[in-house]
Interface confidence: low
């Protein structure tokens, strides 16, 4: 049974150019975390995987940096990096767990975090 | 359900083009992505490549690059694969299917299949 | 392109009886596998993703394993109704990439 619950940033924004942190937090299971997958809809930006540490898809290499921790930071970013981003988390014995963060990058300096939220 | 209606059988001539259809039912289009699936007479399976709704991108097997076609309605849920410049090598079952939630990245859902005849 | 070897090409089985069906990846993965079943003249059908993941509906006696770049599916007891073609496929990079397939018929 899948007792954990996945924390986000939720809804976040940052200015055109600058930088975010995605993170995501796994909580509430003694499930071992096997795998992190970060990916857009239609995209894998990066995985860490337990065994074999950070991978960063070779189109993403030069504006995605790994960490801190299980999350990922994006570099130089731009309007067209707006959009979800999903943190999957693979298990082991639950299965896996998915948390969604939506980023809206800003022309302007008006860029604010959103409150956080959860992900059964 | 989720059901996925693809176009009827054809016949066509070397040289010719061929537009197949894909209508998608029971689901939101625009929330996944629809591959395109190849397979000759008693052999494997072939991908040709995939096509986000949404945001409109295409990934194509560099195979098919010149070949197939991929576009999308998001008004009538349909995606749709244009054959071009056919010969005997394109007589094949064509299969469109679903790619599933973001965290599968596969096919769940599939179409029943297109028949492709290539002959003079 | 990432290579994908299946074995073995076809076996058959008796009812009851474990077969495991093997896919090898030319490259590291990272459980980025699937495995499809497609019984005659019907579409392939999805059984597992993410290297262990069983898909909706599926029975029980199907299940996977593996890791890196070698993957496995076994089925706990061959039923009559197994006898398909079973096809590994990589999703990790483009162009996806499917295994030869395995013929697997009842003894």
């Known amino acids: 049974m899948m007792t954990g619950t996945i924390e986000t940033t939720g809804n976040i924004s940052a200015e055109k150019g600058g930088s975010i942190i995605l993170q995501c937090h796994l909580s509430s299971t003694t499930a071992q975390v096997t795998q992190v997958n970060w990916e857009q809809q239609d995209q894998l930006l990066a995985i860490c995987n337990a065994d074999l540490g950070w991978h960063i898809s070779p189109s993403f290499k030069d504006r995605v940096a790994p960490g801190p921790g299980l999350g990922l930071t994006l570099q130089s970013l731009t309007v067209n990096d707006t959009g979800e981003y999903f943190c999957i988390y693979h298990t082991y014995p639950d299965g896996t767990y998915t948390g969604r963060i939506f980023l809206e990058v800003l022309e302007s300096s008006v860029a604010e975090h959103g409150a956080r939220f959860q992900i059964p | 359900q989720v059901q996925l209606q693809e176009s009827g059988a054809e016949l066509a001539r070397p040289g010719a083009s061929v537009k197949l259809s894909c209508k998608a039912s029971g689901y939101t289009f625009t929330s996944y992505g629809i591959s395109w699936v190849k397979q000759r007479t008693g052999q494997g399976l072939e991908w040709i490549g995939e096509i986000y709704p949404r945001s409109g991108n295409t990934y194509y097997n560099e195979k098919f690059k010149g070949k197939a076609t991929l576009t999308a309605d998001k008004s009538s849920s349909t995606a749709y694969m244009e054959l071009s410049s056919l010969t005997s090598e394109d007589s094949a079952v064509y299969f469109c299917?679903?790619?599933?939630?973001?965290?599968?990245?596969?096919?769940?859902?599939w179409g029943q299949g297109t028949i492709l005849t290539v002959s003079s | 392109d990432i290579q994908m070897t299946q074995s073995p090409a076809s076996l058959a089985a008796s009812v009851g009886e474990t077969v495991t069906i093997t896919c090898r990846a030319s490259e590291h993965i990272y459980y980025s596998l699937a495995w499809y079943q497609q019984k005659q003249g019907k579409s392939p059908q999805l059984l597992i993703y993410?290297?262990?993941s069983l898909e909706d509906g599926v029975p029980s006696r199907f299940s996977g394993s593996g890791s890196g770049t070698q993957y496995s599916m076994k089925i706990n007891s061959m039923q009559p109704e197994d006898t398909a073609t079973y096809f590994c496929?990589?999703?990790?990079?483009?162009?996806?990439?499917f295994g030869g397939g395995t013929k697997l018929e009842i003894k």
């Open positions: 993410n290297a262990n």
């Open positions: 299917a679903r790619k599933g939630p973001y965290y599968t990245k596969n096919e769940d859902y």
């Open positions: 496929k990589q999703a990790y990079d483009v162009p996806r990439t």
